[in-house]
């Protein structure tokens, strides 16, 4: 006997269509674009019915139910809101991702689709998250100061200043929300020791009791660094296990653009922020600052033959500054910190040198500070940061 | 942010009847979005479904447990519930209720054991 | 009646990849779930309709299925991936779990 003619669930449709349905013959149930099968609670790929000899179907017509994309994922440092209507999540829904304003930035527009394959899909098709990244190199510091001839910093002025404690002091700059930037000798050894590595950020007082703590997930040393043999290519990077949230306080120091070069020409003034030895000899309780002019760098690497530090030679990979008279330098202490420079363009500061070595009278006449030449290293910096894929000692890079 | 919480006796005699509750908060029970489900987890073992049910009452069940299993709903509680008749020490599991959106299990309680044992 | 067939246990190193297997007689012809359990606690759905994740779940956990086996993939395993793992699929209106895969991460 035949089965009773199927009738297609709204937004629908049924194939093939015949006249009468016999013993075998079959239909299919096809939904149009944003639904879905659901026979009860459970989602379909397919549905297709059977006639019986009883002249019953073998399993009941399912629904077409509109797609679903569910509620979206939370946006790191953003936020979601819906368009379409409260918590509308179906079909054609529009949500809008937006970053906190003032120290966050979105690559994209935000904008995502609930669209047929249940997918929230940016207008560029992608299905993944927006990105919030830190904003970079904004500071109050308008400039002029062991730190030697300094003056104390007030804050937001070096946001991205990192003090980092081990058997020594050294200073670090914060380059994202989770990797720090600092010299290969103040770290070295600690690839292995990482956790006696403290590292805290957010601070003027050295001993400040309030601070953004963070710990380092991994240490990378540059692979031509060759410790207690000169200071040549003294760059390290250090992994943060946690993402630190970024604020007036707290905030990565820009990398250099390629037209960096111009900024930092013989002569032009950079600033350099640092806990370390003071004219007093003694560990800075504030953090202090001071402005100081590059150095022609033939003259740098003389003046170094002429007094030699022991075992360093100023390389290519390096930087001078400070003044012929002295009285102006970074000092133990100060190693890692960032020499930085302002983009008058962009009006951020970016990092173009590191605290890395000088001679051991700190601001003496023609014993310069020597900085790690951080335009050398931006495919390193890059390549590491886009290479890292999480924990494990084999991604401790190090001599 | 639903959450779901299961009650009843820890301890049931063999050839009785288990009988465990889920207080649905934080949403309604009565959403046309959900359906309400029961899995269970003997010690040391994988999961199992017994069933689901929708907040008009419509139910269905594991056709292993069938005849012994029935889901109710009590939507002015924001409550459903499971039966288990003639249980034996085979029925001694973590029972776990959660809401069931579109054959997804999400979110569960955070179980019961229940022992079956004279 | 229907069967989900896992592999008991597997390990994986930190970093590396995990790919927790789930078969059953023309399995891709219906969707399959994923859910984690860590030792105490309840289960927790991680990928639903074979490839799609919950809100919360990281993006290192992907899925797939097709023919007979449906595939949980955890990318850049980190420790705290260590759990069981169930797929869970829906047989004519009756949901079956496969028996669970025990991740160990090494170190």
């Known amino acids: 006997q035949p089965c009773p003619d199927p009738t297609a669930p709204p937004n629908g449709h049924i194939s093939p269509v015949q006249a009468t349905y016999v013993l075998k013959d079959s239909f299919s149930v096809f939904c149009k674009t944003g639904f879905e099968l659901l026979q009860g609670s459970v989602p379909l790929k397919s549905f297709t019915a059977v006639c019986q000899k009883d002249g019953s179907w073998d399993r009941p017509i399912p629904e077409c139910s509109i797609i679903d994309c569910g509620p979206p994922d939370d946006l790191p440092n953003g936020h979601v809101d819906y368009i379409t209507g409260p918590e509308v999540t179906t079909y054609k829904a529009v949500i809008q991702y937006s970053c906190e304003e003032t120290f966050y930035t979105m690559s994209s527009n935000g904008k995502y689709v609930c669209e047929a394959d249940g997918f929230w899909t940016s207008s560029k098709g992608e299905k993944s998250l927006p990105v919030c990244k830190p904003v970079c190199g904004l500071s109050t510091h308008t400039s002029g100061g062991q730190i030697i001839g300094g003056q104390p910093a007030k804050p937001g002025d070096f946001p991205w200043q990192v003090l980092l404690l081990g058997e020594t002091t050294a200073a670090g700059a914060l380059i994202h929300d989770d990797w720090v930037l600092t010299a290969a000798h103040a770290v070295y050894g600690k690839t292995e020791a990482m956790s006696s590595l403290d590292i805290r950020m957010g601070i003027l007082k050295r001993l400040s009791l309030i601070y953004t703590q963070a710990w380092p997930e991994a240490v990378f040393i540059h692979e031509g660094y060759t410790h207690g043999a000169g200071f040549d290519n003294d760059i390290a990077l250090i992994k943060l296990k946690n993402k630190v949230t970024i604020n007036r306080n707290i905030m990565p120091i820009c990398l250099p653009r390629k037209e960096a070069a111009s900024l930092m020409k013989t002569d032009f003034v950079g600033t350099v922020a640092g806990w370390g030895l003071t004219q007093k000899g003694f560990l800075a309780r504030n953090l202090m600052f001071v402005d100081i002019p590059i150095v022609d760098h033939q003259k740098c690497a003389t003046a170094y033959t002429k007094q030699p530090y022991p075992g360093a030679k100023v390389t290519v990979n390096m930087l001078c500054a400070g003044l012929d008279r002295g009285g102006k330098d970074a000092c133990r202490g100060d190693s890692g910190g960032a020499l930085v420079f302002l983009d008058n363009e962009t009006q951020r500061w970016f990092v173009g040198g590191i605290v890395s070595w000088g001679s051991i009278n700190c601001g003496g006449s023609e014993q310069y500070g020597v900085y790690t030449k951080v335009t050398n290293y931006i495919p390193w910096i890059e390549n590491i940061i886009n290479n890292f894929g999480g924990g494990g000692s084999h991604h401790h890079h190090h001599h | 942010q639903v959450q779901l919480q299961e009650s009843g006796p820890g301890l049931v005699k063999p050839s009785e009847t288990l009988s465990l509750t889920c207080t649905v908060s934080?949403?309604?029970?009565?959403?046309?979005?959900?359906?309400w489900g029961w899995i269970r987890q003997p010690p040391g073992k994988g999961l199992e479904w017994i069933g689901s049910i929708y907040y008009s009452g419509s139910t269905y069940y594991n056709p292993s447990l069938k005849s012994r299993v029935t889901i109710s709903v009590d939507t002015s509680k924001n409550q459903f519930s499971l039966k288990l008749s003639s249980v034996t020490a085979a029925d001694t599991a973590v029972y776990y209720c959660?809401?069931?959106?579109?054959?997804?299990?999400?979110?569960w309680g955070q179980g019961t054991m229940v022992t079956v044992s004279s | 009646s229907y069967e989900l067939m896992q592999p008991p246990s597997m390990s994986v190193s930190p970093g590396q990849t995990a790919s927790i297997t789930c078969s059953g007689d023309?399995?891709?012809?219906?969707?399959a779930y994923w859910y984690q359990q860590k030792p105490g606690q309840s289960p927790v759905l991680v990928i639903y309709q074979d490839n799609k994740r919950p809100s919360g779940i990281p993006e290192r956990f992907s899925g797939s299925n097709s023919g007979n086996t449906a595939t949980l993939t955890i990318s850049g395993t980190q420790a705290m991936d260590e759990a069981d793992y169930y797929c869970?699929?829906?047989?004519?209106?009756?949901?079956?779990f496969g028996g669970g895969t025990k991740l160990t991460v090494l170190g």
């Open positions: 023309k399995l891709g012809d219906i969707y």
């Open positions: 959660a809401r069931d959106r579109r054959g997804r299990f999400d979110p």
């Open positions: 869970q699929a829906w047989e004519s209106s009756t949901g079956v």
């Open positions: 934080g949403g309604s029970i009565s959403s046309s979005s959900y359906y």
